[in-house]
């Protein structure tokens, strides 16, 4: 039941995460214009991965795509790359991880195999989370260095420019909702690998042998024995089937027909 | 980086016109200028986006007109009856996936 429960939350948590990545890939607000000590007094800019917005002063805003690597920083690219990987992991990892789902019947799937798949589907959103976190990252650290440079730039009028004519850029919504999606999809990702172990199969059977001493001679016993993960309740060795032998707490020193040859 | 190049500055007398144009490197997502005149705050003249809509400063109303071309990697300002108040170093603004300045140009009309 637990097993089920964290399986099914594990599951609708990176759901609930992957949306979010593909929400924050999408959105527009992945940089806004900063507002203090704004040059620009008549519009108000921020950019997405894909397109970049302009809001004037009457409310109108006009949003155009990038239609050229031209004058767009490197780094863009391989923010984006990592977004879309993080996506397609994630819907992978949702498509593997419903066909895993302990209450969803399919066939004569054996547990052995629907805990694999979940395993798989649980690293699949582990990396599709941090897919996610590092392109969010990648760009919030590309948008700091930015700002202080553009800060260094007002103050020092760097290269030229004249002093207040700089724009600066901070932290837009995108970003949160990249991070918190991503994380979401990671802690989703590690339910569904705590869940695998639950799946997985706890005993395995295997032949023993038992040697005990029965008054001058050995008695070889061959017996069927249940060994144990630790995580099952078989931790006194029972037997599974009686093949003559016995545990060692039901051992007895009296002799038996077979004990003299 | 998107690189902006601008011309058509210099002296005039009042009365007179002056064309100004911001080349950019690339195709622009809105352009504009705004000037800066000896010990006064910087203020907008007027910009222009990619569809054409433009925006302009209630002092230059009626006399200055912004236009593009059609790729947007040119934008002009179109400035007539020139007024000794706009004497000013005018800068271009380019914004594309960040905002792009010049180093300016200077506008100087004598009365």
């Known amino acids: 039941m637990a097993v089920t429960a964290c399986q099914g939350l594990g599951f609708v948590v990176s759901l609930i995460g992957i949306a979010g990545i593909i929400a924050a890939t999408c959105m527009d607000q992945w940089s806004t214009q900063d507002l203090y000590n704004n040059p620009v007094t008549a519009v108000f800019n921020y950019q997405g991965l894909w397109r970049s917005c302009v809001r004037e002063s009457s409310g109108f805003t006009e949003c155009r795509g990038y239609f050229t690597l031209l004058g767009l920083p490197a780094m863009l690219q391989a923010v984006r790359a990592l977004m879309i990987v993080g996506i397609v992991l994630g819907a992978i990892g949702l498509l593997v991880s419903i066909f895993a789902l302990k209450c969803i019947r399919i066939g004569s799937m054996e547990d052995s195999a629907k805990a694999n798949m979940t395993l798989t589907s649980g690293i699949m959103f582990i990396v599709s989370g941090l897919c996610a976190i590092a392109g969010v990252s990648v760009f919030a650290n590309m948008l700091v260095t930015n700002f202080w440079m553009s800060t260094a730039n007002m103050y020092t009028g760097m290269g030229g420019m004249v002093q207040t004519v700089q724009t600066r850029y901070t932290f837009g919504a995108a970003l949160f909702v990249g991070w918190v999606a991503g994380g979401l999809t990671l802690i989703g990702g590690v339910m569904m690998c705590i869940a695998c172990r639950g799946l997985a199969p706890e005993e395995t059977n295997y032949k023993a042998v038992s040697y005990h001493a029965s008054g001058h001679s050995v008695a070889y016993k061959p017996g069927g024995f249940k060994a144990s993960t630790g995580f099952g309740s078989n931790t006194k060795n029972k037997k599974i089937y009686d093949g003559g032998a016995r545990t060692e707490d039901e051992v007895q020193s009296y002799p038996s027909k077979h004990d003299y040859v | 980086d998107v690189q902006l190049v601008e011309s058509g500055g210099g002296l005039v007398q009042a009365g007179g016109s002056l064309r100004l144009s911001c080349a950019a490197s690339?195709?622009?997502?809105?352009g504009g200028w705004y000037r800066q005149a000896p010990g006064k705050q910087r203020e907008l003249v007027a910009t222009?986006?990619?569809?054409?809509?433009?925006n302009y400063a209630d002092s230059v109303k009626g006399r200055f007109t912004i236009s593009g071309d059609n790729s947007m990697n040119t934008v002009y300002l179109q400035m007539n009856s020139l007024k000794p108040e706009d004497t000013a170093v005018y800068y271009c603004?380019?914004?594309?996936?960040?905002?792009?300045w010049g180093r300016g140009t200077q506008v100087t009309v004598s009365s």
């Open positions: 690339v195709g622009i997502f809105m």
């Open positions: 603004y380019a914004h594309y996936w960040r905002d792009y």
């Open positions: 222009i986006s990619s569809s054409g809509r433009t």
